[in-house]
């Protein structure tokens, strides 16, 4: 099925979803190692079988990842390689999602209740906004289809809503700084202790200085994952989640807490 989709000259949103599902065998939300090599092989075979040339995007993709076993791509990168229908592709090419900081600001706008989730209705509005910003309008049926597909693509724990880390897969892998924090997330108890101890003035939120101190310590403890030279970027991205410079417990938890105790 996925192979026949790869032969198409234009891939629909639902076909794109099937292709992704087929190659992301472990359901990690990324294609890496064997998964990525399988995709490249099948893509080359499919285009050859259909008598289609590789597009410039496909060519540079194969050049970049064909000979590497350390490659890793997300949904965004794949959407740029495959000839996907325009409106769906726009969701991955949105200006608001070009940088992590912009993404965080967008998240803050839609996660209005600071619940740490964007639910179906909020997601629909989010996608509608993205398309409108690109001067595109889609009918409600198409919008519902896109919303459903986005949930299917990103909702890795199948709870019918998107967490920040799930939604962040809309970002190119290189831009997705949240990935760096995945390996160093604290359990709920540790996170609460850190939040309390770094909230120097006890006002119930973390300000930029307190975040700076916390991040410097995290970089010191996790040199493999975090680079102290990138602290300004980390800080800027995380502060984009704040409410007028106030980073509340639930907001910081999105980045640093694994949730359980």
């Amino acid at each position: 099925m996925a192979e026949s989709h790869l032969q198409s000259s234009l891939i629909t949103a639902s076909q794109f979803f099937e292709i992704w599902l087929h190659f992301d065998a472990d359901g990690s939300g990324y294609l890496e190692g064997k998964e990525l090599q399988n995709l490249i092989q099948e893509l080359l075979q499919a285009r050859k079988k259909a008598g289609l040339e590789l597009s410039p995007e496909m060519k540079s993709f194969v050049d970049q990842y064909g000979q590497r076993d350390d490659g890793k791509i997300g949904i965004v990168e794949l959407a740029h390689v495959l000839p996907t229908e325009e409106n769906f592709l726009l969701l991955f090419r949105c200006q608001q999602l070009k940088s992590c900081e912009e993404f965080m600001k967008t998240w803050r706008k839609y996660d209005t209740d600071h619940s740490g989730f964007i639910e179906t209705e909020e997601l629909k509005n989010f996608l509608k906004d993205l398309l409108e910003k690109a001067n595109k309008t889609v009918d409600d049926t198409k919008l519902a289809e896109y919303t459903d597909l986005m949930l299917k693509l990103f909702d890795s724990n199948n709870d019918g809503k998107l967490e920040l880390t799930e939604m962040a897969r809309l970002l190119p892998v290189q831009e997705n700084f949240l990935l760096k924090f995945q390996g160093i997330k604290m359990c709920g108890k540790e996170f609460n202790k850190a939040f309390e101890l770094y909230d120097q003035d006890g006002n119930g939120y973390i300000d930029e200085n307190e975040l700076d101190a916390l991040l410097k310590d995290l970089c010191e403890k996790n040199k493999q994952e975090l680079d102290i030279n990138n602290i300004t970027t980390y800080k800027k991205n995380i502060m984009a989640l704040s409410d007028g410079g106030k980073l509340y417990r639930t907001d910081l938890a999105l980045i640093l807490s694994a949730g359980d105790n």
């Epitope: 309390e196 120097q200 700076d212």
Partner: antibody, heavy 117, light 111 residues
Framework: QGQMQQSGAELVKPGASVKLSCKTS????????ISWLKQKPGQSLEWIAW????????NYNQKFTGKAQLTVDTSSSTAYMQFSSLTAEDSAIYYC??????????WGQGTTLTVSS | DIVLTQSPASLPVSLGQRATISCRAS??????????MHWYQHKPGQPPKLLIY???NLESGVPARFSGSGSGTDFTLNIHPVEEEDAATYYC?????????FGGGTKLEIK
């Protein structure tokens, strides 16, 4: 183990200003807060203010706003407190102390300030 | 500002006995499962030394004869058994909110 070395005793005239220093070592200065505290003879301690060494941002006890001014020099890991418009009331021992979290774990040895004509 | 009242102001104790110092806050200094009360030992000519942080945690290098307890508004520092070198003034301090304040101090004397 962190260390904080404060400047020597000062004898100054009323109305003058004085700048006390606190040179630190043995811990990461840029992710620490440095607080300054006052102790008059036979009395308890009073928290004056803190400065976050990473950015130079400050937080003052209202009582000392306009009286104390805190700065840092990150290149030498040194914190400073300038005390202005001195009166006899300002005669005291002044301590600098570090807090990474919400308690003062390293202290300087103290600087005695005497304001007298 | 939160006012901390320490008692007694002076405490004569015999060697090997227990010394109990109390600190009462004018409002709760506990929140989110933490109590922002700390204890310091101060000897003449030396800087204060952190003994106990967050009500009951012993600072590293401090002998186990020192212990702290309490939550909300009432806190206690216990020293048992008291040794000669424990003669000093002890202060409680809160960091629940700004400004941070200290208790008036308790002078421990060895009888």
């Amino acid at each position: 183990q962190g260390q904080m070395q404060q400047s020597g005793a000062e004898l100054v005239k009323p109305g003058a200003s004085v700048k006390l220093s606190c040179k630190t070592s043995g811990f990461t200065f840029s992710s620490s807060y440095i607080s300054w505290l006052k102790q008059k003879p036979g009395q308890s301690l009073e928290w004056i203010a803190w400065i976050y060494a990473g950015t130079g941002d400050t937080n003052y006890n209202q009582k000392f706003t306009g009286k104390a001014q805190l700065t840092v020099d990150t290149s030498s890991s040194t914190a400073y407190m300038q005390f202005s418009s001195l009166t006899a009331e300002d005669s005291a021992i002044y301590y600098c102390a570090r807090h990474k979290y919400r308690y003062l774990d390293y202290w300087g040895q103290g600087t005695t300030l005497t304001v007298s004509s | 500002d939160i006012v901390l009242t320490q008692s007694p102001a002076s405490l004569p104790v015999s060697l090997g006995q227990r010394a109990t110092i109390s600190c009462r806050a004018s409002k709760s200094v506990s929140t989110s499962g933490y109590s922002y009360m700390h204890w310091y030992q101060h000897k003449p000519g030396q800087p204060p030394k952190l003994l106990i942080y967050l009500a009951s945690n012993l600072e590293s290098g401090v002998p186990a004869r020192f212990s702290g307890s309490g939550s909300g508004t009432d806190f206690t520092l216990n020293i048992h058994p008291v040794e000669e070198e424990d003669a000093a003034t002890y202060y409680c301090q809160h960091t629940r909110e700004l400004p941070w304040t200290f208790g008036g101090g308790t002078k421990l004397e060895i009888k």
